[in-house]
Interface confidence: low
């Protein structure tokens, strides 16, 4: 009689994570008597996956009724596959004894697991940067298999070319991670811009995953200042305005100085938003020129988003305004309004 053969017809089986995998195994004879066991890996460190005789294997079921005496099909189904299940599975026939002894092994079936990459997570720099500066964004995605993967960067739909990508580990693994760093040059119009990291993988069936970062979290657009003297509102009163334009983010503190002395400090509140996402704000100072003997240097000093202050000055010629007799007090008002 021909000697028993253990036949594993599939050299490999590939499934997606979360699915079930069937590993086929048949024997050609009922003799010798003895159980079948399934192992992952070979050699002394092999892992028992299923034992026909005993044990609790909750994710493994037999495909056929292996308890029947004449059964020669010992195929198994493994449910809820994860990347950790990847490896080569062996169907092994044992000869009944005390103890049972290994008789013959099948050639093995390699189980490969297709696992989707996690949603790409895009991180920007820790501190804000100003236009014309180059900033780095990182994109990470994990847990995918097989190793082949494509990553692209976009800014507002335009593909970026200045980036470096690594897939780890370099050797064989049950799953992989990708890490990419892109360099982006900021412009003044980038408050509404987005940087997108796009990952394409065989498991995604042509529908790539995207991670995004809003440049509004990264950019700081410094303001431009303009100090102007408005027409006289009343005799001896001059209205001076400080236009603070095109800044982002909104956090801004403005200080009026008269001849170097602090007159008033206020925080930007009622701002207007430009189409590009930057803000405008206007503050005004009402100066009673009769309170001054000499010319007045008015300075609008702005501290934006914790950065060093910038300022713009305006010289107010007192001599050009008639002095009110007997006036020796400064009657100054400040305020802000929407532009």
């Amino acid at each position: 009689e021909e000697e028993l053969q253990v036949i594993q017809p599939d050299k490999s089986v590939s499934v997606a994570a979360g699915e079930s995998a069937i590993l086929h195994c048949t024997v050609t004879s009922l003799i010798p008597v003895g159980p079948i066991q399934w192992f992952r890996g070979a050699g002394p460190a092999r892992e028992l996956i299923y034992n026909q005789k005993e044990g609790h294997f909750p994710r493994v079921t037999t495909v056929s009724e292996s308890t029947k005496r004449e059964n020669m099909d010992f195929s198994i189904s493994i449910s809820n596959i994860t990347p950790a299940d990847a490896g080569t599975y062996y169907c092994v026939k044992f000869r009944k004894g005390s103890p049972d002894t290994e008789f013959k092994s099948g050639a093995g079936t390699e189980l490969s697991v297709r696992a989707k990459p996690s949603a790409p997570v895009v991180s920007g720099p820790a501190a804000r940067a100003t236009p014309q500066h180059t900033v780095s964004f990182t994109c990470e995605s994990h847990g995918f298999s097989p190793r082949d993967i494509t990553l692209k960067w976009f800014k507002n739909g335009n593909e970026l070319s200045d980036f470096q990508t690594n897939v780890d580990p370099v050797g064989e693994s049950v799953s992989y991670s990708i890490h990419s760093t892109a360099k982006v040059v900021l412009t003044r119009e980038d408050v509404h811009s987005q940087v997108i990291c796009e990952v394409a993988h065989v498991t995604l069936q042509g529908d790539p995953l995207r991670g995004t970062a809003n440049l509004s979290e990264t950019i700081r657009v410094p303001p431009t200042l303009e100090v102007t003297q408005q027409p006289v509102r009343a005799e001896n009163q001059v209205n001076v305005t400080c236009q603070v334009r095109k800044f982002y983010p909104q956090r801004l503190q403005l200080t009026w100085l008269e001849n170097g002395n602090v007159s008033r400090t206020e925080t930007a509140s009622t701002v207007t938003e430009n189409k590009d996402g930057t803000y405008n704000w206007m503050s005004w100072l009402l100066v009673n020129v009769s309170a001054h003997r000499d010319d007045v240097k008015l300075t609008c000093q702005v501290e934006h988003d914790g950065q060093p202050a910038v300022s713009k000055s305006h010289d107010l010629k007192v001599s050009a305004h008639p002095k009110e007799q007997g006036s020796n007090t400064a009657a100054e008002n400040t305020g802000s309004n929407e532009r």
Epitope: V121, V191, H192, N214, S216, P249, Q250, K275
Partner: antibody, heavy 118, light 107 residues
């Protein structure tokens, strides 16, 4: 100022679909994510997904098993959320919300009550 | 998915009390956390963004702190209009997830 105005309350039969609209004004419609969030009676908030009207890119909460479809009409600055195969547990207030100036969920619509009942 | 666990789920307090609500993420979310206030029949209102920042119009008695996985919302001196339900939200990764809410009631 930024405003999100949602369509009125709906009563639907189980198995049918509902389409809720969210009309945006006061900002550049194509430049901000629009999220959809729902809240069942007396319950917490649950994110359903987002759409980026600029390129119609979407991302969905897989919990909804493909029952949610988000779309946006740039010509009318209106976003839509369609939920199919309705069941009684889909009875909820559905909100649209936008990211604005880098702040997520900065502005919300007033909500649309969808009641699923046979 | 990232789980957001708020505690307590409900809280009774009096006007003038200092109140603290915590939110714990099941994994590191950095600073991608927002707090909302919701009153019955109304849409949620943004209260604090990027963990600590108050948008315009939110009183300074509200403050936020934390990073990584543990976050706190503090109301330094409760006012009558503060009695509402408060939610945290993480937007570090999809799906975006909210805490289950903390209902703040008058004692």
């Amino acid at each position: 100022q930024v405003q999100l105005v949602q369509s009125g309350a709906e009563v639907k039969k189980p198995g049918s679909s509902v389409k809720v609209s969210c009309k945006a004004s006061g900002y550049t419609f194509t430049s901000n994510y629009i999220h959809w969030v729902r809240q069942a009676p007396g319950q917490g908030l649950e994110w359903m997904g987002w759409i980026y009207p600029g390129d119609a890119d979407t991302n969905y909460n897989q919990k909804f098993n493909g029952r949610v479809t988000l779309t946006a009409d740039k010509s009318t600055s209106t976003a839509y959320m369609e939920l199919s195969s309705l069941r009684s547990e889909d009875t909820a207030v559905y909100y649209c919300a936008i990211n604005y100036g880098g702040i997520w969920f900065a502005y919300w619509g007033q909500g649309t009550l969808v009641t699923v009942s046979s | 998915d990232i789980q957001m666990t708020q505690s307590p789920s409900s809280l009774s307090a009096s006007v003038g009390d200092r109140v603290t609500i915590t939110c714990q993420a099941s994994q590191d979310i950095g600073n991608k956390l927002i707090w909302y206030q919701q009153k019955p029949g109304k849409a949620p209102k943004l209260l604090i963004y990027y963990v600590t920042n108050l948008p315009g119009g939110v009183p300074s008695r509200f403050s936020g702190s934390g990073s990584g996985t543990d976050f706190t919302l503090t109301i330094s001196s409760l006012q009558p209009e503060d009695f509402a339900t408060y939610y945290c939200l993480q937007y570090k990764q999809n799906p975006l997830t909210f805490g289950q809410g903390t209902k703040l009631e008058i004692k």
